[in-house]
């Protein structure tokens, strides 16, 4: 059978080979399509309810004034010329409809690096056969389920026209330090060959890089936090972030009732000052961030270092805040 591709709504003429150019003609067309259950026979003498769909022209050709989805199928003509020689024509008709240009809807203007983001939804309306949607990043195809790319697809069919609407939702996880203005586009590829893809207008969301929170450093003087009774310990909380955050102090996991300050001085250390100290930096944008904890201990005369597992008292002694 000869393959014929016809656009929905357009006319189609199928030639009946070997048919005399004008009546009288001995020919018959047989159709097996979505409009028939088995074979429907149409003859030149016909003319009737089928004329709106298919009718035999004076030259023996079959004329379809406006091809529809239900006209997909097999068309056969059997003709006899004036000398009684029989010729058969056989056609396999497929129909198609090119949709309108696809569009990206609900598109994001900003993406966050390192986390999954919805880029947008690509919509194509009015295709037949359904066809496919695919996404591109900077002109290169994006492969779902690779490198933080995921795609959710949906296909719907119009109850009356039989045409398809396709939807494809793109989620990506942009890499940190990647392109700050990636270009995304979506394209529709028809279900029938020999028709080029249709591409959306591109979108260029900004990629926002959340500033990684640098660690809050707690520096203790003397190093190691072991001091002789009556000595002084200085704790300094170093935070690289700008603007400078508020610094509060904790002892043994309990906030110390002191005004915010990056430096905590413990003069004239006594047993009550022993314990585990840390600082908490509170940023307006990021919330609180705690430093590592350091242990402050008293070295009795003759000891080489901090007492293992020493536990400080609950008193604050005399504190000085720089």
């Amino acid at each position: 059978a000869q393959n014929i591709t016809a656009r929905i709504g357009e006319p189609l003429v199928l030639k009946c080979k070997g048919a005399p150019k004008k009546p009288p003609q001995r020919l018959e067309w047989k159709l097996n399509t979505g409009r028939t259950e088995a074979w429907k026979v149409l003859s030149p003498q016909g003319g009737g309810p089928w004329d709106s769909v298919a009718r035999v022209l004076p030259n023996g050709s079959l004329f379809l004034p406006a091809v529809g989805i239900q006209d997909e199928g097999i068309f056969r003509c059997q003709a006899m010329n004036r000398n009684g020689k029989e010729t058969k024509s056989n056609y396999r008709v497929r129909v198609y409809q090119i949709p309108g240009k696809p569009e990206i809807v609900d598109s994001a203007s900003e993406l966050t690096a390192g986390v999954p983001n919805k880029v947008g939804t690509c919509v194509s309306e009015g295709s037949y056969p359904a066809g496919t949607l695919s996404w591109h990043l900077d002109g290169k195809p994006l492969v779902p389920n690779e490198k933080g790319v995921s795609v959710k697809e949906q296909t719907r069919r119009h109850p009356e026209t039989g045409l398809f609407t396709l939807q494809s939702e793109l989620m990506v996880t942009p890499a940190r330090g990647g392109d700050p203005r990636p270009t995304f586009s979506c394209s529709f590829s028809p279900g029938l060959p020999r028709h080029r893809a249709l591409r959306t207008a591109p979108i260029q969301p900004r990629v926002w890089e959340p500033v990684p929170l640098e660690e809050v450093q707690l520096v203790v003087e003397p190093e190691g936090g072991a001091v002789a009774p009556g000595g002084t310990v200085t704790l300094t909380c170093e935070v690289p972030a700008q603007p400078s955050p508020q610094i509060h102090w904790m002892k043994d996991g309990v906030p110390l009732p002191l005004p915010p300050s990056p430096v905590l001085i413990l003069p004239e250390i006594g047993p009550q000052d022993q314990g585990t100290y840390s600082c908490v930096a509170t940023h307006s944008s990021h919330g609180p961030q705690e430093s590592r904890a350091v242990s402050i201990s008293i070295i009795e005369p003759g000891e080489e270092g901090p007492t293992a597992g020493s536990v400080g008292g609950s008193g604050l002694g005399t504190l000085a805040l720089a």
């Epitope: 028939t36 259950e37 309810p49 004329d51 769909v53």
Partner: antibody, heavy 119, light 107 residues
Framework: EVQLVESGGGLVQPGRSLKLSCVVS????????MTWIRQTPGKGLEWVAS????????YYPDSVKDRFTISRDNAKSTLYLQMNSLRSEDTATYYC????????????WGQGVMVTVSS | DIQMTQSPSSMSVSLGDTITITCRAS??????VNWFQQKPGKSPRRMIY???NLADGVPSRFSGSRSGSIYSLTISSLESEDVADYHC?????????FGSGTKVEIK
């Protein structure tokens, strides 16, 4: 709302002529074939004439061929049936209907108009 | 020409009954058969199109079926409002042909 309203019926003598009209609304007239169907008490429903959406092609049964002419004015969304050489057996209620091809099988009907052929 | 032989010509039934009306086509008309309901003094109303499809607004107790050249209209659990004449029509070939009609009455 789809509406088909027939007019032009009445009492006419055998051999005379009558023209029926059908004004439609509620759908795109020139997208559809249109058909006249009649009903006689004795014979039930009978197809009278069909016309394609452009008006280029018309179809009739042998019983009215060469006597009746179906036509349409797409600009006025109006269907016509010109009936000549009327006979007593043409006495019937005439209905205007939407459809007539295989895609639309008479989904809407007018209220009908009575034609009586009698001397 | 195609003949559509409709039977029965009339039937007297009880409310709640299930009834079937048939039309036999004298030659192949495929799926191109419609069924119409006509109440006294009213225009016909399409009930079933293309042999088996229920027209808009028609109660689901109506159904159409086909077995070869025999087309059937079934009304399950008949209601008083279903009292009417019923007609089949083939619209596959000219001349378009109606069945002779079936009158459905209540006993």
């Amino acid at each position: 709302e789809v509406q088909l309203v027939e007019s032009g019926g009445g009492l006419v003598q055998p051999g005379r002529s009558l023209k029926l009209s059908c004004v439609v609304s509620g759908f795109t007239f020139n997208n559809y074939w249109m058909t006249w169907i009649r009903q006689t008490p004795g014979k039930g429903l009978e197809w009278v004439a069909s016309i394609d959406n452009s008006g280029d092609n018309t179809y009739y049964p042998d019983s009215v061929k060469d006597r009746f002419t179906i036509s349409r004015d797409n600009a006025k969304s109006t269907l016509y049936l010109q009936m000549n050489s009327l006979r007593s057996e043409d006495t019937a209620t005439y209905y205007c209907t939407r459809g007539g091809d295989i895609t639309t099988g008479f989904d809407y009907w007018g209220q009908g108009v009575m034609v009586t052929v009698s001397s | 020409d195609i003949q559509m032989t409709q039977s029965p010509s009339s039937m007297s039934v009880s409310l709640g009954d299930t009834i079937t009306i048939t039309c036999r086509a004298s030659q192949d008309v495929g799926i191109y058969v419609n069924w119409f309901q006509q109440k006294p003094g009213k225009s016909p109303r399409r009930m079933i199109y293309r042999a088996t499809n229920l027209a808009d607004g028609v109660p689901s107790r109506f159904s159409g079926s086909r077995s070869g050249s025999i087309y059937s209209l079934t009304i399950s659990s008949l209601e008083s409002e279903d009292v009417a004449d019923y007609h089949c029509l083939e619209f596959d070939e000219h001349p378009l042909t109606f069945g002779s009609g079936t009158k459905v009455e209540i006993k």
